[in-house]
Every structure is written in C-alpha cells, then in structure tokens.
C-alpha cells in the first residue's frame, strides 16, 4: 500500500500480513475533554476493525490527567469483542492538570512490559490523544527520546476543541503534539477541530497503523 493507501501491486495488501502489533492508547482524561462520548466513539470505530488476540494485535489503554491509570493491559482481553465492551466502559477520570509526558512515560515503562502483556520482538505502537498543552512539557523531549530508543512508533492526536471554544491560539499546542509524533510527522500527527470530529480520522489512522504490519 502506498503512503496514500492506494494499492500497489508489488506489495501484499495489508490484510494478508500476519505480523503482530502491540498498541497502547494513551488518553488524556482531564476535565477539558468534552463530550467524553466522542472519545469512546472514536475508540469503538478504531478498535472494531482490529483483529485482537494473543497471537494477533493486542491493545492496552492508559488514561492520564494529573495521575496515570492503566485502564487495561495489553494481555487483558483476547478478542475484539471483549476489548470493545471494556473500551465502552472507560469513563473520564478528570484532573486539573495534563501530565502528557508522565502519561507517555508510564505507557513506555509499564504498559509495554512483558508483565503487562507486551511480546518480545513485536512492533510497539502508541496512540496519544490529548486536548491541551502539557503541564510537564519540560520532560517531553527526554520522554520522546526514550520511546524512540525503544522503537515505539507514536501517533499523536491534538483535539483543538477547548482552544476553539475559548478562542485561543492553537499554535504552541499543535507544535507540542507534533513533537510527540514519530517521523515523518505528516503521517503520524493528526489534529481535529473538536472532540466530535475524532471519528473523521479513524479510517486514515487505522490504515496507517496497519501499514506498519507490511
């Protein structure tokens, strides 16, 4: 599949590959994300097309605000159906601060461990969804470098909703979230105008994640 997802005859289509992925989704659950239903709809639309299982794709979810919570580990569920049920039940934990570096670092150090289901030799993918600048951005550069050193592919999503609602400049925020994404940035960074628009990036994000299998 080419970068624009047109079928290229010389490469086997994405679905034919049986390569495994370990995917950890890092969700900003701070108070400013609204409505939370849009986040769960996004998760549903992204996850429902994945082949989830111990020998296929595994998915874990981490939520952060001021603190970090492992919603479920990579090896917790062994089917797409189970993951969808669990993802629907995830509520926003809230928090006045957005500790994005902490969320990413915890995912790297804890969610991607064998104890929590990560598999040796399997490609690691992190999807970070956030709606605001981090309160610990002084740590971001080091945290991202650590992810890079561990070959964790990162997709980052900036939700501009709270900025647009407050008529605030998004420039600094977008730059920060771009810095989280793997290179090339244009293939790994997404921004959406508000939470409701999250579903509009699902298909492109999904194909890009699965292009990593090829």
């Amino acid at each position: 599949v080419s970068p624009t997802f047109q079928v290229v005859n010389s490469i086997a289509p994405v679905q034919e590959c049986s390569t495994q992925l370990d995917i950890v989704i890092v969700l900003d659950g701070s108070n400013s994300i609204y409505p939370w239903d849009s986040v769960t709809a996004f998760l549903n639309d992204l996850l429902e097309r994945m082949d989830i299982g111990p020998k296929q794709t595994q998915v874990g979810i981490v939520q952060y605000g001021e603190n970090v919570t492992h919603e479920f580990n990579l090896n917790k569920y062994s089917s797409t159906e189970e993951v969808l049920v669990a993802a629907k039940k995830i509520g926003r934990r809230g928090g006045l601060q957005t500790m994005t570096a902490l969320g990413i670092d915890t995912a790297r150090k804890e969610a991607f461990t064998e104890a929590r289901g990560a598999r040796r030799g399997v490609k690691k993918v992190m999807v970070i969804v956030t709606d605001g600048e981090s309160h610990d951005n002084h740590r971001l550069k080091k945290v991202i470098q650590d992810c890079e050193d561990e070959n964790i592919q990162r997709f980052s999503i900036a939700i501009l909703g709270s900025y647009n609602r407050g008529n605030l400049s998004t420039e600094k925020f977008v730059e920060e979230i771009k810095s989280i994404a793997s290179e090339p940035t244009e293939k790994h960074f997404f921004n959406v105008s508000d939470e409701l628009a999250l579903v509009t990036i699902v298909k492109t994000l999904g194909e890009r994640i699965f292009a990593l299998e090829a």
Partner: antibody, heavy 120, light 113 residues
Framework: QVQLVQSGAEVKKPGASVKVSCKAS????????MHWVRQAPGQGLEWMGW????????NYAQKFQGRVTMTRDTSISTAYMELSRLRSDDTAVYYC?????????????WGQGTLVTVSS | DIVMTQSPESLAVSLGERTTINCKSS????????????LAWYQQKPGQPPKLLIY???TRESGVPDRFSGSGSGTDFTLTISSLQAEDVAVYYC?????????FGQGTKLEIK
C-alpha cells in the same frame, strides 16, 4: 482471480427470514472484510454492514440493527447474511462485496447478487 | 450519517459528447492533512452488480477507460465522461467512505440521446 458467488433467488412470506450465502475464492478469505449492500427494484444502493471473516466481528447499519445477522464459515470461505422479520419493502437484490483495505470501504469485487422477493 | 445527493437524476447525451455527473455530500469527506477525498464512483449496468470506476475521488481503477475521470474536493464532486460511448449507458453512483456507515448517492441514469 477473486470471485464471489452468491446463492440463488428466494421467495419468502412477510415475517419470515432469509439467509443468503456468498462463497469467496481466489484470495485469503479471512484477510478482507465482506460487505453487504442491497438494491430494491429500480432503486439505489443501500449499505447494510460488514463482517470481518477473521474475527467474526460485525458492523451493521442502524436501519438493520436487530434484524440482520452476518456470519461466516471460514472452513468453506463463505459469508452469510440473514435478514429476519421480512417485510415487502425488503424485496431487493442483495450483494456481497469485498473491500480492498481494512478501514476504507470502497468495494472492488462484487457477487452477482441474490434476488429476495417478499410476498404473501 | 453523511447524505450523498447526485444530480441530475437522469440525462440523455449524444454519442461522442462530453458528460458530467455531480455528487454532493452533506459534510466534507476531505481528509485535509493529506488532501485525500474519501469518495468513490461506480457504474451499474442493468442486471449486473456495480463496478468500481474511481476511488480517492480521482484515482481511476485499473482497467477503467481513461475517458472516465473524477474531480472535486470537500463536498462537491464530478464524474466526467469525455466522449460518451454506447457501452457507457448505465446508472452511476457516488459513495463516501469517510465515516461509517458508508453511503451512496441515489444514482444518475445515463442514456443515449
């Protein structure tokens, strides 16, 4: 080459159920999503939903929720679409169709269609 | 859900003439970060299943004659047949695959004048 061969025409009474099959060949059946699209006589195309033959996962259009069931038998590379509580306006040609990619639903390969007539 | 509206509903064109069919979506199907429009065009002849002509709004499927072309962006799209041939008599449908559920236009019937 990819081929989707559907079961033959059916005549059903209102309130009954119909199960249409779609046998796939020429590719790895579990590797690609199968979609179902219907077309009432003289009308346009209506997407009904998809099944992931690998996991059995499904996504149904809201209009058909509760009435449609999509299943598959991987041992014979066949997908099925069952529609229950049939009404006269379910009279249509039902197509199975295969997508090229996992998330993008443009449909390159189509079955020949199965005419389902609902009449008392 | 995204609603797709085609115009005209039917048209009659002389052989060799250029013809255009329009399709409008109720919301944008443009993925702006890479300029991809999630739109496909199909041709359906009587008694046959639809045939994919174009995807990404303008990418011609392999084997489709180059007299067929697609254009447009966002919410407004056009299928153009540069020189109508007798075998082009059919119903043409647009389809968006930007958001689930994917949806089709109501169809445009093309006949020979």
């Amino acid at each position: 080459q990819v081929q989707l061969v559907q079961s033959g025409a059916e005549v059903k009474k209102p309130g009954a159920s119909v199960k249409v099959s779609c046998k796939a060949s020429g590719y790895t059946f579990t590797g690609y999503f199968m979609h179902w699209v219907r077309q009432a006589p003289g009308q346009g195309l209506e997407w009904m939903g998809w099944i992931n033959p690998n996991s059995g996962g499904t996504n149904y259009a809201q209009k058909f929720q509760g009435r449609v069931t999509m299943t598959r038998d991987t041992s014979i590379s066949t997908a099925y679409m069952e529609l229950s509580r049939l009404r006269s306006d379910d009279t249509a040609v039902y197509y199975c169709a295969r997508s090229v990619l996992r998330y993008f639903d443009w449909l390159l390969w189509w079955g020949q269609g199965t005419l389902v007539t609902v009449s008392s | 859900d995204i609603v797709m509206t085609q115009s005209p509903e039917s048209l009659a064109v002389s052989l060799g003439e250029r013809t255009t069919i329009n399709c409008k979506s109720s919301q944008s199907v443009l993925f702006s970060s890479n300029n991809e429009n999630h739109l496909a065009w199909y041709q359906q002849k009587p008694g046959q299943p639809p045939k994919l002509l174009i995807y990404w709004a303008s990418t011609r499927e392999s084997g489709v004659p180059d007299r067929f072309s697609g254009s447009g962006s966002g919410t407004d799209f056009t299928l153009t047949i540069s020189s109508l041939q007798a075998e082009d008599v059919a119903v043409y449908y647009c389809q968006q695959y930007y958001i689930t559920p994917c949806s089709f236009g109501q169809g445009t019937k093309l006949e020979i004048k």
